[in-house]
Every structure is written in C-alpha cells, then in structure tokens.
Amino acid sequence: APVPPGEDSKDVAAPHRQPLTSSERIDKQIRYILDGISALRKETCNKSNMCESSKEALAENNLNLPKMAEKDGCFQSGFNEETCLVKIITGLLEFEVYLEYLQNRFESSEEQARAVQMSTKVLIQFLQKKAKNLDAITTPDPTTNASLLTKLQAQNQWLQDMTTHLILRSFKEFLQSSLRALRQM
C-alpha cells in the first residue's frame, strides 16, 4: 500500500520544510485517498465489465450512498462553510460502512482497500477538528450499519461486483466535491 501523506521519503529528506497547515493536510489526505480509490477501481474494472455496465440503476436502488446536493451548501450557489463541513463529515461517516464492505472484495489490492478505509478515518478526525458545530453531525446507527453490511454481503456475485463499483465511484465523486468545497474555505 502507498505510504500515508507526510510519511514519504521526500518529507524525511526535507526537515527544513514548513509543516503543513490544517487545510493543506486535509487536501493532501483527500488526494491520497483518491489515489487509493483509483487503484481499487483499476482492479474492479479489469476484473469485470462493471465500469461499462448500463445496469447500475438495478444495484443503486439497494444503496443509499451519500451524494452532494445544492442544499448541502458545498456548491458556489448557496455556499455555506459550516453547513457544508457538516455534510462532508456526515457523508464520510455514512461511507464508513461501505468501506468496511469493500475490505474483502479485493485480491491484489487488499492492502490498498485497508489504506483507503484507515485514511478516511484519519480524514474524519482532521475535519472534526475544523468543524465548530459538532452537535449537528449525526453518527450512523451501528445496528443499522451491521444489518446493511450483512445484506450487502448476502447479495449474489454480480450484485456484489456492481455494489463494489458503485461504492468506489460514489466515494470518489463525494471526495472530489468535498475537496472542491474545502478549497474555498
């Protein structure tokens, strides 16, 4: 798996560099996760034809993947820093169960899947430090998550492959929209 941000040999070799600001650290962390997703998508797309499939709607009905909408305050029209930050953190917390589902879905990229999951946990911690209104953040119910995980794992092979593809695609889009907004803060 790739080395987490801030721990690569370049960083060690350049101790005179300014430490990263909180915003830079978050930016770097998201880009690191996006790299991980890219590697996982490569394996998924090579293994099956899901990336070209037009039957996504069939599987999407079973999933309630977080998505960025205008009301969330993360787009330029109606941009609201605090509302947006709450949406980003809430969305990432909701994605955690889906990232857990991904853990046994990869053969050659098992470590990469773990790295994406762990890096997301770190990202959530970074963002929680940035948020002023932590009370507005709703944490998913563990019981609901456990039953969702069981349900997803009980799907047939085709649906499991499709679910994997959809989770990766949606998570990528969510992170891209999140970082777009965070770069305005």
């Epitope: 998201i30 880009r31 996006l34 960025m68 205008e70 787009f75 330029q76 990528k172 889009e173 891209q176 929209s177 970082l179 777009r180 770069r183 305005q184």
Partner: nanobody, 124 residues
Framework: QVQLQESGGGLVQAGGSLRLSCTTS????????MAWFRQAPGKDREFVAD????????WYAESVKGRFTISRDNTKNTIYLQMNSLKPEDTAVYYC?????????????????WGQGAQVTVSS
C-alpha cells in the same frame, strides 16, 4: 498529463459575445476537473471559472459571475466558456487547464495540464 487545445478566441466589441472551446484527446476526459484562467498584458494569470466532474458543480470568479458560463460535453471531450456582455477589461489570453484528480479550484497549482492559450480582445 493531457494535451489541451483552445479555440474560439478573437476580436469582439464591448457588449458582444464569444465562445471559447477547449478540447483534449484524453480517453478519461470525464474524470478531469477543468478550468479557464486568463492573463492580461502585464498582469498575473487569474482564475476565471471551473467545472467539476459533475457538470452542476461550477465556480466563477466574482468579476465574471453572471456574464460567463462554463460547461462541458464529455462525449466530445470538450469544455466551453460562453462569454457574454464582454468588457475591455476581459481582454487577455485565456488558458484551459485540467486537474487529473477531478477536483479543481481557484489556484493554478491545482492543475497539472495546460493549453497554449487563446487571445481574446475586447475593443471599446
């Protein structure tokens, strides 16, 4: 990195319109966030507008908001900048830029591919 090619620049009178296009041969064009920057003579290059992988997610510089519209057509590997109500101060070389992370933003450092630029001149 992808090759970017701008077109559609030219000379126009104040109050007129112009549409810039930026095309790439990249196979994964839809994965890129795309932007327009501009550089007026003797000035620094500045952000104009950008568009995420989701076409609804656009950002504009305050100076062009309401006059310029950025859009993309993934089937044609092309982004557009529709410029209306042009002003002499819009005169500049307009550059197209791409971010392979699909994120974008208002800073030049976020972009890893750049076009050669298209000259836009607005006469009064």
């Amino acid at each position: 990195q992808v090759q970017l090619q701008e077109s559609g620049g030219g000379l126009v009178q104040a109050g007129g319109s112009l549409r810039l296009s930026c095309t790439t041969s990249g196979r994964t064009f839809s994965d890129y966030a795309m932007a327009w920057f501009r550089q007026a003579p003797g000035k620094d290059r500045e952000f104009v507008a950008d568009i995420g992988t989701n076409s609804e997610n656009t950002w504009y510089a305050e100076s062009v908001k309401g006059r310029f519209t950025i859009s993309r057509d993934n089937t044609k590997n092309t982004i557009y900048l529709q410029m209306n109500s042009l002003k002499p101060e819009d005169t500049a070389v307009y550059y197209c830029a791409a971010d392979s992370y699909g994120v974008g933003g208002g800073k030049q450092e976020y972009y890893d591919s750049w076009g050669q630029g298209a000259q836009v001149t607005v006469s009064s």
